[in-house]
């Protein structure tokens, strides 16, 4: 679609005569008829296939034609066309004398013609005017012409439609050749695709407007390049969404089971050595002079019972001192001046002579020890308590004081994590190697089934005929929103077909 524009500039008819040579009375009141048609090697009469246009009376005899002439005329004259411009044309311009006000062809005498010019040739679409001048015996016409495209049409033949827009269907202006030129921030064939924030992850991010970065499920961060770990993942990471890969020293489904208690909590005091012995379990090896599960207790030097043969121990600032009973001497009362004749063996121990009576040895009954059977056997020396339990002597027996999470005579049994019924709302508890897990009944969630979640009544797709299902969260029931033409609580009945009830 385009317009052939013809700009009349000057018409000269100095003698004021018609084509027949007869003068106009009182002067030639001149108007023009224009015929535009397809290219003809010889311009001949016939239909004006590209259009016609007439002017009002523009002047008398000789005159210049102003741009956009008054009196209802338009200059340049417009000959619109609704087809692809072929690039060639034929043009006929006739100057007529108007004796009266009626300019219709049938109202004019045949000899009212002043002059007629016919041209043909090639003409490309463009903004530049082509200037031409046609002279006959008595008249001269100066004019210019061009072809331009109508609004929103572009290209060499005005065949390319392009209308700038900035809406859901596109964000662009038009280039001179009719190609789209996207507005800043938009891309794609029709400039419908926003250009996301620079660096926004190609797969994991998207945007609905320029310079935005919205994350797809499972991704987070300004550029949507950080995955979201699985729900409840404590000491773990992910490389794709919802994973939970445990950090060093952590285990269990949610990486919340401490496999390296020593490193994470440093429970052993006073320079003791810590050894991991299972989940949340450790053993401290104390340095000399310390005791307790965590080596938190400082030993008095006398606590190790260094004095033998019934000697009594006294703490001193720089160590300890043994007070020996009669018949013994030495740093630890280890040397004896006694013999079997002095009955040195206590608690029913039997005495044996050694070195021809210069020395002796006591053979102790069960539960007693020491060179004179003076000490009760300490049943805790063999560290019988497992899992960091503390050994206590109780008369002729011993007992283990267990750490939380362990039980049994020797603290050898793990307390079942499920024993304390940790799962709320009737959840089923499962003991795991690394803790416990709750399987929740419908309507509850969370690590311990403590969170009430509404049951999705729509999960079973109860609505028929493409109805939309909504869950009523207060009652955990569903409501079906029926499409046009269906009724019923599940939209199961077509309108006009009442349900067939059995009664």
């Amino acid at each position: 679609s385009g317009v052939f524009q013809l700009q009349l500039q000057e018409f000269i008819n100095e003698r004021g005569v018609l084509a027949s040579g007869r003068p106009c009375e009182p002067g030639c009141r001149t108007f023009f008829r224009v015929c535009l048609k397809h290219f003809q090697a010889v311009v001949s009469p016939g239909p004006c296939t590209f259009g016609t246009v007439s002017t009002p009376v523009l002047g008398t005899n000789s005159f210049a034609v102003r741009d956009d002439s008054s009196g209802g005329g338009r200059n340049p004259l417009q000959l619109p066309f609704n087809f692809t411009w072929p690039g060639t044309f034929s043009l006929i311009i006739e100057a007529w004398h108007a004796p009266g006000d009626d300019l219709r062809p049938e109202a004019l005498p045949p000899d009212a013609l002043i002059s007629k010019i016919a041209i043909q040739g090639s003409l490309a679409v463009g903004q530049n005017w082509l200037l031409d001048e046609q002279t006959s015996t008595l008249t001269r016409l100066r004019y210019s012409y061009r072809v331009i495209c109508s609004d929103n049409y572009y290209g060499d033949n005005c065949s390319r439609l392009c209308k700038k827009r900035n809406d859901h269907f596109g964000h662009y202006v038009c280039q001179p050749d009719g190609n789209l030129s996207c507005l800043p921030g938009w891309t794609g064939e029709y400039c419908q695709q926003p250009i996301c924030l620079s660096g926004c992850h190609e797969q994991n991010g998207y945007c609905s407007k320029p310079a935005e970065c919205l994350c797809r499920p499972g991704w987070q961060g300004r550029l949507c390049n950080e995955c979201i770990p699985h729900n409840g993942c404590r000491h773990g990471t992910c490389s794709t969404p919802w994973q939970c890969t445990c950090d060093e020293g952590w285990g269990g489904l949610f990486c919340d089971q401490d496999l390296n208690y020593c490193t994470h909590h440093s429970p052993c005091k006073n320079g003791a050595t810590c050894s991991n012995s299972g989940q949340r379990s450790y053993t401290c090896t104390c340095r000399p002079g310390y005791t307790g599960v965590d080596c938190e207790l400082e030993l008095s030097e006398c606590d190790s019972n260094p004095c033998r043969n019934g000697g009594s121990c006294k703490d001193q600032e720089d160590g300890y001192h043994c007070l020996c009973p009669p018949g013994y001497y030495g740093l630890h009362c280890e040397h004896s001046t006694l013999s079997c004749a002095d009955s040195p063996c206590f608690n029913g121990g039997s005495c044996r002579e050694r070195n021809q009576g210069a020395n002796y040895a006591c053979e102790c009954p069960p539960n007693f020890t020491g060179s004179n059977c003076e000490k009760k056997v300490d049943r805790c020396t063999s560290n019988p308590c497992a899992n960091g339990g503390q050994c206590l002597n109780r008369g002729p027996s011993r007992m283990c004081r267990c750490r939380p999470g362990f039980t049994g005579t020797y603290c050898e049994l793990h307390v079942s994590d499920c024993a304390r019924n940790p799962c709320a709302h009737g959840g089923t508890c499962h003991d795991l190697e690394n803790g416990l897990m709750c399987t929740c009944p419908a309507g509850f969630s969370g690590r311990r089934c403590e969170v009430r979640t509404s049951i999705d009544a729509c999960a079973s797709s109860p609505c028929f005929n493409r109805a939309t299902c909504y869950t009523d969260l207060s009652t955990d029931t569903f409501v079906c929103n029926c499409p046009y033409g269906f009724v019923g609580s599940r939209c199961e009945f077509p309108v006009g077909l009442p349900p067939s009830f059995p009664w």
Partner: antibody
Framework: EVQLVQSGPEVKKPGASVKVSCKAS????????ISWIRQTPGQGLEWMGW????????DYAQKFQDRITMTTDTSSTTAYMELRSLRSDDTAVYYC????????????WGQGTMVTVSS | EIVMTQSPGTLSLSPGDRATLSCRAS???????LAWYQQKPGQAPRLLIY???NRATGIPDRFTGSGSGTDFTLTISRLEPEDFAVYFC?????????FGQGTKVEIK
């Protein structure tokens, strides 16, 4: 014994939808996720996505994002995969496989469901 | 997406031979996210190796996985008649998780 048993073969027309089920047994269903993988002669094995039976979170391969839905029913220990707007190149064997969020492999696999899309 | 390329496409060997299958990732993959599967005709794939080098339960010790970064290898030290099948590698370090196109081990 840990087992995944899938629903039977399906024949569908282009544009239709298919819903394949995967019944799990022999383990605690909610401790794991279910992945869906398909096998076509032309494309080999193709991962489609996975769902966590613990909380229902899903991660779909972008190729299928707009037309796939994965769900689980913990009461029946069954996982479902629905694929919409079927095309002839969706003709494949569809497998479900157990997957754990902290163990990054598929074990075991279901026996497979043949889905044929043809007009 | 990460492209997993397996080579060779087909390996023609005799029982008792040693088989070496290669899997190359288009970018570096953490070993804990790499697995190998075996598939026999008409059957579903079966897990062989996980975490690049750990044998799955019940897998004989003639199967060995190794490698890191972009290059991974599955070695079958002495082929048994039941080992003739197609073998796939798979990564789950980057979404979408991807498989290799497979290596067919056939009887020569």
């Amino acid at each position: 014994e840990v087992q995944l048993v899938q629903s039977g073969p399906e024949v569908k027309k282009p544009g239709a939808s298919v819903k394949v089920s995967c019944k799990a047994s022999g383990y605690t269903f909610t401790y794991y996720g279910i992945s869906w993988i398909r096998q076509t002669p032309g494309q080999g094995l193709e991962w489609m996505g996975w769902i966590s039976a613990y909380d229902g979170n899903t991660d779909y391969a972008q190729k299928f994002q707009d037309r796939i839905t994965m769900t689980t029913d913990t009461s029946s220990t069954t996982a479902y995969m629905e694929l919409r707007s079927l095309r002839s190149d969706d003709t494949a064997v569809y497998y479900c496989a157990r997957y754990s969020w902290n163990k990054h492999w598929f074990d075991p696999w279901g026996q497979g469901t043949m889905v044929t899309v043809s007009s | 997406e990460i492209v997993m390329t397996q080579s060779p496409g087909t390996l023609s060997l005799s029982p008792g031979d040693r088989a070496t299958l290669s899997c190359r990732a288009s970018q570096s993959v953490t070993g804990s996210y790499l697995a190998w599967y075996q598939q026999k005709p008409g059957q579903a794939p079966r897990l062989l190796i996980y975490g690049a080098s750990n044998r799955a339960t019940g897998i004989p010790d003639r199967f060995t996985g190794s490698g890191s970064g972009t290059d991974f290898t599955l070695t079958i030290s002495r082929l048994e008649p039941e080992d003739f099948a197609v073998y796939f590698c798979q990564q789950s370090a980057f979404s979408p998780w991807t498989f290799g196109q497979g290596t067919k081990v056939e009887i020569k």
